[in-house]
Amino acid sequence: LPAQVAFTPYAPEPGSTCRLREYYDQTAQMCCSKCSPGQHAKVFCTKTSDTVCDSCEDSTYTQLWNWVPECLSCGSRCSSDQVETQACTREQNRICTCRPGWYCALSKQEGCRLCAPLRKCRPGFGVARPGTETSDVVCKPCAPGTFSNTTSSTDICRPHQICNVVAIPGNASMDAVCTSTSPTRSMAPGAVHLPQPVSTRSQHTQPTPEPSTAPSTSFLLPMGPSPPAEGSTGD
């Protein structure tokens, strides 16, 4: 590496690389300064003059130390089913993620391209696998002895209450009804909820979503509404 006293632009020693925050300009054959995030190269370096940097204009950005002639355009505004988790600034692109109750059906490298509402399991079906930021809810039929009487993306199948004397037997979509004598055991009256996926601001603190078992062919699907899967509703 060249001595620390070398000022840009300078010719690197054979076989060496330029220093941090510098780049090798093929035309000038010199090591030249990069521009800092939020700036771009207004004038490239020559053998006798260093790179001239300028600030990015509104709605454009550079995230890295760079020598690009123009800043990058920020992505379009987030759609109504999304929330802006990172604003467009001179140093970073806008990032849109799905709002609560939705999941990312078609992701892009940072953020989400297409959000879809989480499937709701209809009565007689409960949540087998909760939705995450990137996967839909999976519904399953309530097994004998359990029921779900709600249309929900979070409710699981719950056990029927056990009666001393059954007035109406339970089924997959209805709890058992006991005669006026108290049941021997009853579940808590409230519906059992699974947590909704939460969109968080930081990329670095998000829990890793459970991988979806569905093949990643979202981009092949028609953009219009699709028929609901068994046990689910599009409501």
Partner: antibody
Framework: QVQLLESVGGLVQPGGSLRLSCAVS????????MSWIRQAPGKGLEWVSI????????VYADSVKGRFTISRDNSKNTLYLQMNSLRAEDTAVYYC????????????WGQGTLVSDSS | DIQMTQSPSSLSASVGDRVTITCQAS??????LNWYQQKPGKAPKLLIY???TLQTGVPSRFSGSGSGTDFNFTISSLQPEDIATYYC?????????FGQGTKVEIK
């Protein structure tokens, strides 16, 4: 959603070779410089190597120069470290890390993979 | 090569205490200094870059200051989850170098 996942390391004979890989997802791999950083058991962090976003610029620590080669395949979102002529002192947990602005500040790290001397 | 010297090598403090770690570079590195937290068995985590800029999602009780050769890292009110080893790292020039680490424990 940024994820970096190193391949499983392993036991290596002195003088032997091993290639580590780091599969990344959740960000545009081809726009970030990447590094390998290692940590010997019970010791501090030691930077090993860095590669530019396009793979055309590579820099190495003196301790590995001539023995290790960093590379990347942007089409596969994967970073590599080819380690040859391994020595006992190369025993360490190896981490791949993303350089947040191409200025050697590492904002996302893999979980680490242990490479150890089998002698 | 730029040597990074951290002190102390370890410290013990009570919950709520103000904790300061220093890092000294063997030559001027302007403000190109980063701080990391590493918990046992985990990968390091970037807390502060460019000497004083807090990384996204990092609690505001962490702060950094300094320029040139002398830098400080402060936890304004130590929390139980802050038990870790903290490293400084210079990003001024190659080879990139780290301090030897400061282990922070709770009294």
């Amino acid at each position: 959603q940024v994820q970096l996942l190193e391949s499983v390391g392993g036991l290596v004979q002195p003088g032997g070779s091993l290639r580590l890989s780091c599969a990344v997802s959740g960000f545009t791999f081809s726009t970030y410089a990447m590094s390998w950083i290692r940590q010997a058991p019970g010791k501090g962090l030691e930077w090993v190597s860095i590669i530019s976003d396009g793979g055309d610029v590579t820099v190495y620590a003196d301790s590995v120069k001539g023995r290790f080669t960093i590379s990347r395949d942007n089409s596969k979102n994967t970073l590599y470290l080819q380690m040859n002529s391994l020595r006992a002192e190369d025993t360490a947990v190896y981490y791949c890390a993303r350089d947040r602005t191409s200025a050697a500040a590492f904002d996302s790290w893999g979980q680490g993979t242990l490479v150890s001397d089998s002698s | 090569d730029i040597q990074m010297t951290q002190s102390p090598s370890s410290l013990s403090a009570s919950v709520g205490d103000r904790v300061t770690i220093t890092c000294q570079a063997s030559q001027d590195i302007t403000n190109f200094l980063n701080w990391y937290q590493q918990k046992p068995g985990k990968a390091p985590k970037l807390l502060i870059y460019d000497a004083s800029t807090l990384q996204t999602g990092v609690p505001s009780r962490f702060s950094g200051s300094g320029s040139g050769t002398d830098f400080n890292f402060t936890i304004s009110s130590l929390q139980p989850e802050d038990i870790a080893t903290y490293y400084c790292q210079q990003s001024d020039s190659y080879p990139i170098t780290f301090g030897q680490g400061t282990k922070v424990e709770i009294k």
